[in-house]
């Protein structure tokens, strides 16, 4: 659809005569009839297949024609067409004399014709005005013409319909060739697809308007590139939604069970070495001079009874000092000036000569020690009880009183409440400091998973379009993770498909 525009510019009829040569009385009151038709190999009379238009009287004899387009007038003349512009045409322009006011063809005498031109033309859409001049012996007509497309029509022959829009059906303007030019932030064949926030994850994110990034179920973050871990996940991460992959040192379904008490709580004091020995249990290896479960107690250096042969120990800032009894000397009173003749062995110890009587050694009865059998044996000195067990002397022997959860002579064995498989229906057992905990599979609950509650929410395959189903164990519901191109709680709705257009 378009318009053939004809601009009449000047008509010259100096002698004021008709085509017959007869003069007009008093002058030639001139109006024009225009016929536009299909291109003919030889211009011939016949229907004006592309349209006709007439002017009012524009002047007398010779005159220039005013451009009236701005004032809503009829120059240029408009010949609209509603077909594909073929590029070629035949144009006939007749100049007529109007003796009266009635300009209808049937009201005019046939000899009222002043002049007539008939041309074959070639004209592309949107070309600049083409100027032409036709001269005869008596008249001259100067005119120009062009073809433009109607509103919303584009292309080389005005055959492409394009109407700019900014609504649900598209967001575009039209290029000169009729192709769509998307408004900023939109893409796709009909500019219906918003361009999401730069970097928005292709599969996990989507948008309904430009520069937006909305996350699909199971994803979060500005660009929807961070998965959402399982509800209740404490010390864990995910690589796909609803996972709970435990950080180092944590265990259990929700990664809330501490497997690395040493690192997380640093219980050992005074530079002691910490060793994990089970869930929430540890052992501190104290540095010299310290004792206690957490090596929190500072030992006196004399506590280890370093002075032998009945020497008395005195604490000093930088260590200790032994005061030796008569007959002994050395750092620890270990050297004797006595012999067996001096009866140096106490508590029934037997004396044996050494080095030809220059020295001696005492052989002590049970429960006594020391170079002169002067010390009663303290079997707890070496701190033999593991896992914070308390050492008790019991006459000639000793025993360890263990903390809850430990057993064995030296409290070295970890008591597992889970050993007897107390969790029913495939529940997972977790040892705790004071007992155990069962993590139940979907569909079971109770302290020992003995109560049947529901079935696996994903068992009925509720997700459509090959979506992945995740069961939310905390609520016994399912979540569908949709593949790209689908939305909805069950991924049942396709997105982004251009609707069929009415045209």
């Amino acid at each position: 659809s378009g318009v053939f525009q004809l601009q009449l510019q000047e008509f010259i009829n100096e002698r004021g005569v008709l085509a017959s040569g007869r003069p007009c009385e008093p002058g030639c009151r001139t109006f024009f009839r225009v016929c536009l038709k299909h291109f003919q190999a030889v211009v011939s009379p016949g229907p004006c297949t592309f349209g006709t238009v007439s002017t009012p009287v524009l002047g007398t004899n010779s005159f220039a024609v005013r451009d009236d387009s701005s004032g809503g007038g009829r120059n240029p003349l408009q010949l609209p067409f509603n077909f594909t512009w073929p590029g070629t045409f035949s144009l006939i322009i007749e100049a007529w004399h109007a003796p009266g006011d009635d300009l209808r063809p049937e009201a005019l005498p046939p000899d009222a014709l002043i002049s007539k031109i008939a041309i074959q033309g070639s004209l592309a859409v949107g070309q600049n005005w083409l100027l032409d001049e036709q001269t005869s012996t008596l008249t001259r007509l100067r005119y120009s013409y062009r073809v433009i497309c109607s509103d919303n029509y584009y292309g080389d022959n005005c055959s492409r319909l394009c109407k700019k829009r900014n609504d649900h059906f598209g967001h575009y303007v039209c290029q000169p060739d009729g192709n769509l030019s998307c408004l900023p932030g939109w893409t796709g064949e009909y500019c219906q697809q918003p361009i999401c926030l730069s970097g928005c994850h292709e599969q996990n994110g989507y948008c309904s308007k430009p520069a937006e990034c909305l996350c699909r179920p199971g994803w979060q973050g500005r660009l929807c590139n961070e998965c959402i871990p399982h509800n209740g996940c404490r010390h864990g991460t995910c690589s796909t939604p609803w996972q709970c992959t435990c950080d180092e040192g944590w265990g259990g379904l929700f990664c809330d069970q501490d497997l690395n008490y040493c690192t997380h709580h640093s219980p050992c004091k005074n530079g002691a070495t910490c060793s994990n020995s089970g869930q929430r249990s540890y052992t501190c290896t104290c540095r010299p001079g310290y004792t206690g479960v957490d090596c929190e107690l500072e030992l006196s250096e004399c506590d280890s009874n370093p002075c032998r042969n009945g020497g008395s120990c005195k604490d000093q800032e930088d260590g200790y000092h032994c005061l030796c009894p008569p007959g002994y000397y050395g750092l620890h009173c270990e050297h004797s000036t006595l012999s067996c003749a001096d009866s140096p062995c106490f508590n029934g110890g037997s004396c044996r000569e050494r080095n030809q009587g220059a020295n001696y050694a005492c052989e002590c009865p049970p429960n006594f020690t020391g170079s002169n059998c002067e010390k009663k044996v303290d079997r707890c000195t070496s701190n033999p009880c593991a896992n914070g067990g308390q050492c008790l002397n019991r006459g000639p022997s000793r025993m360890c009183r263990c903390r809850p959860g430990f057993t064995g002579t030296y409290c070295e064995l970890h008591v597992s409440d889970c050993a007897r498989n107390p969790c029913a229906h495939g529940g997972t057992c977790h040892d705790l400091e004071n007992g155990l905990m069962c993590t139940c599979p979907a569909g079971f609950s109770g302290r020992r998973c003995e109560v049947r509650t529901s079935i696996d929410a994903c068992a009925s395959s509720p997700c459509f379009n090959r979506a992945t189903c995740y069961t939310d164990l905390s609520t016994d519901t399912f979540v569908c993770n949709c593949p790209y191109g689908f939305v909805g709680s069950r991924c049942e709705f396709p997105v982004g498909l251009p609707p069929s257009f009415p045209w």
Epitope: Q40, P45, G121
Partner: antibody, heavy 118, light 107 residues
Framework: EVQLVESGGGLVQPGGSLRLSCAAS????????MYWIRQAPGKGLEWVAF????????YYRDSVKGRFTISRDNSKSTLYLQMNSLRAEDTAVYHC???????????WGQGTMVTVSS | EIVMTQSPATLSVSPGERATLSCRAS??????LAWYQKKPGQSPRLLIY???RLQDGVPARFSGSGSGTEYTLTISSLQSEDFAVYFC?????????FGQGTKLEIK
Amino acid sequence: EVQLVESGGGLVQPGGSLRLSCAASGFTFSNYGMYWIRQAPGKGLEWVAFISHGGGITYYRDSVKGRFTISRDNSKSTLYLQMNSLRAEDTAVYHCAALNWELGIDYWGQGTMVTVSS
Amino acid sequence: EIVMTQSPATLSVSPGERATLSCRASEDIYSNLAWYQKKPGQSPRLLIYAANRLQDGVPARFSGSGSGTEYTLTISSLQSEDFAVYFCLQGSKFPLTFGQGTKLEIK
């Protein structure tokens, strides 16, 4: 008096060239589309080429496309036909004509003979 | 191209009688048809254009009719000067095409 006078015909060897002219007088040459039409000995009339009044449109019959060129000089009221790569089948009397039946115009020249022979 | 077929090839008629010549187009030419008279050594002379319009200066005994693909030239009362070759020409589309001609001879 309307006159169309052709010139430039003659004997030429196959593959040779000729340029025909048609001088117009007695009418406003620049107002009309012009045609070259030929008639081979013992044959009917055959259209050859067309040029619009301003020279913007040209058409040729298939057998001469690429070999013949029609042109016009409105200031000299003259029509031309440049004929290259001539063939024996181009032998004919060549007429120029001004045809515009809408205006009742039908002017023909007497013709010029073109003979293509070795 | 549009093929123009004239009939008959030769027509023998006595002076004063009516002659009817036919021209058929291979497709619709929308009345864009002319009839010419051709005598030896002369240029063709236009008789009828637009299928039925008489050219200025042509006697009224010549008339044309027809539409679409079928066209007729009628000479109502033949004069001696009318014996010649008559051909039709379609001006609807390029290439312009002529009929092969009808020779009108004295019977």
